[in-house]
């Protein structure tokens, strides 16, 4: 049960996550225009990743596309290829994840096919995280440098008589919504990686198996955890029965060299 | 058509207080802000300030804040400007003007002006 | 504030010649989000409200005869009249519409020999 949750809770945050990177990605608001200490201009520049925006003081708002692709910033280019990376991932992601699902009933799927499909888009939630949130400080990076920049030659002109207003820009919200996005999808993939550990079954090394010798004496044999990636392996604990060498879901064990005394 | 339409002179003591309305014909009156100016006789034009009837958004120059007052009446609209503690100064034609929404970004529609005298 | 200032003053023509008057800002007027020049043109006659002649420094609000263009961009403006009419007579103002408050230029009259 405490599996299921976990998974579906998973789900659920790398779901929300996943909307968060692609509103973000396409919002306009990644840079916004620094009103603070500044002329108050009639106009409010920002820009996002794929165009830039002016809303005059009649409320009137217009956008203009980046139409060139080689004339961009490579940085620019650099975070739309992380932000569009992580959404990428994340939707493979969140389909790898319906199928995996233990709530879902896909005909005959096994528990262990299940477990390996929960722990891969768990990855992939995490992998997609971690995209946005780089491709959010990049951009956040290169905002700084351009503000400080921007600062020191505020106002340029000749001799100080003719001044130019120079547009410092601070972070957006699209930079906000990025970064929380980012986390929750991260958040979302570590709790499906923990769900997938409780889905596979353990692969028994005949953990306190007994076996019957010829005679009375009996040799025992206490076995320790296998340490299991999840892919592939049984990775569920068995309640052991007392008379035999098979567990109660009737999974053969296989003798190692080790477990003969 | 687009009409703003101001009310009539008016001769006021100094100290006083006017209180003079711009009211538009022919347009979506929430859609465009309207902006203030103060013609001194036989001279230039000063920005008093603009009222935005979508969100109520007021802005004013520094020089009249204390002295102009924006207010709106929407059901009939209407933007007024009271003008307080009257002076000398004061004497000019007030004008209200729409500002485009879009383009032109620019005043495009003007009101006749309301002279205000101040003598006493 | 951002202090406009025109020039000349007053300017006395003759019908059908062309006029030129400058307008200059203390402070740049271009805003490099959209490389619009927020500079305004208006014409008011004698006892008259302003009309809108040029915005955003060269576009000419419909309605204004091809002979009215602008031209200019960060801190210096013109307005140029190709053949000058009659009805041309008038006081031409020039206006900041980038940072508040917005200001007016002083103005250019242009008078008839």
């Known amino acids: 049960m405490a599996v299921t949750a976990c998974q579906g809770l998973g789900f659920v945050v790398s779901l929300i996550g996943i909307a968060g990177i692609i509103a973000a990605t396409c919002m306009d608001q990644w840079s916004t225009q620094d009103l603070y200490n500044n002329p108050v201009t009639a106009v409010f520049n920002y820009q996002g990743l794929w165009r830039s925006c002016v809303r005059e003081s009649s409320g009137f708002t217009e956008c203009r596309g980046y139409f060139t692709l080689l004339g961009l910033p490579a940085m620019l280019q650099a975070v739309r290829a992380l932000m569009i990376v992580g959404i990428v991932l994340g939707a493979i992601g969140l389909l790898v994840s319906i199928f995996a699902l233990k709530c879902i009933r896909i005909g005959s799927m096994e528990d262990s096919a299940k477990a390996n499909m929960t722990l891969t888009s768990g990855i992939m939630f995490i992998v997609s995280g971690l995209c946005a949130i780089a491709g959010v400080s990049v951009f956040a990076n290169m905002l700084v440098t351009n503000f400080w920049m921007s600062t020191a030659n505020m106002y340029t002109g000749m001799g100080g008589m003719v001044q130019t207003v120079q547009t410092r820009y601070t972070f957006g919200a699209a930079l906000f919504v990025g970064w929380v996005a980012g986390g929750l999808t991260l958040i979302g993939g570590v709790m499906m990686c923990i769900a997938c550990r409780g889905l596979a079954p353990e692969e028994t090394n005949y953990k306190a198996v007994s076996y019957h010798a010829s005679g009375h004496s009996v040799a025992y044999k206490p076995g320790g955890f296998k340490a299991s990636t999840g892919f592939g392996s049984n990775t569920k604990n068995k309640k052991i029965y007392d008379g035999g060498a098979r567990t109660e879901d009737e999974v053969q064990s296989y003798p190692s060299k080790h477990d003969y005394v | 058509q687009v009409q703003l339409q101001q009310s009539g002179g008016e001769l006021v003591k100094p100290g006083a207080s006017v209180k003079m309305s711009c009211k538009a014909f022919g347009y979506t009156f929430t859609t465009y802000p309207i902006e203030w100016m103060k013609q001194n006789h036989g001279k230039s034009l000063e920005w008093i300030g603009n009222?935005?009837?979508?969100?109520?958004?007021?802005k004013y120059n520094e020089k009249f804040k204390g002295k102009a007052k924006l207010t709106v009446e929407k059901s009939s609209s209407t933007v007024y400007l009271e003008v307080s503690r009257l002076t000398s100064d004061d004497s000019a034609v007030y004008y209200c003007a729409r500002r485009a929404y879009g383009y032109p970004y620019a005043m495009d529609y003007w009101g006749q002006g309301t002279s205000v005298t101040v003598s006493s | 504030d951002i202090v406009m200032t025109q020039s000349p003053s007053s300017l006395t023509v003759t019908a059908g010649e062309k006029v030129t008057m400058s307008c200059k800002s203390s402070q740049s007027l271009l805003n490099s989000g959209n490389q619009k020049n927020y500079l305004t043109w208006y014409q008011q006659r004698p006892g008259q409200p302003p009309k809108l002649l040029i915005y955003?420094?060269?576009s000419r609000e419909s309605g204004v005869p091809v002979r009215f263009t602008g031209s200019g961009s960060g801190t210096d403006f013109t307005l140029t009249i190709s053949s000058v009419q009659a009805e041309d007579l008038a006081v031409y103002y020039c206006q900041n519409d980038y940072i508040y408050p917005y200001t007016f230029g002083g103005g250019t009259k242009l008078e008839m020999n």
């Open positions: 955003r420094a060269s």
């Open positions: 009222f935005h009837p979508y969100n109520d958004d007021t």
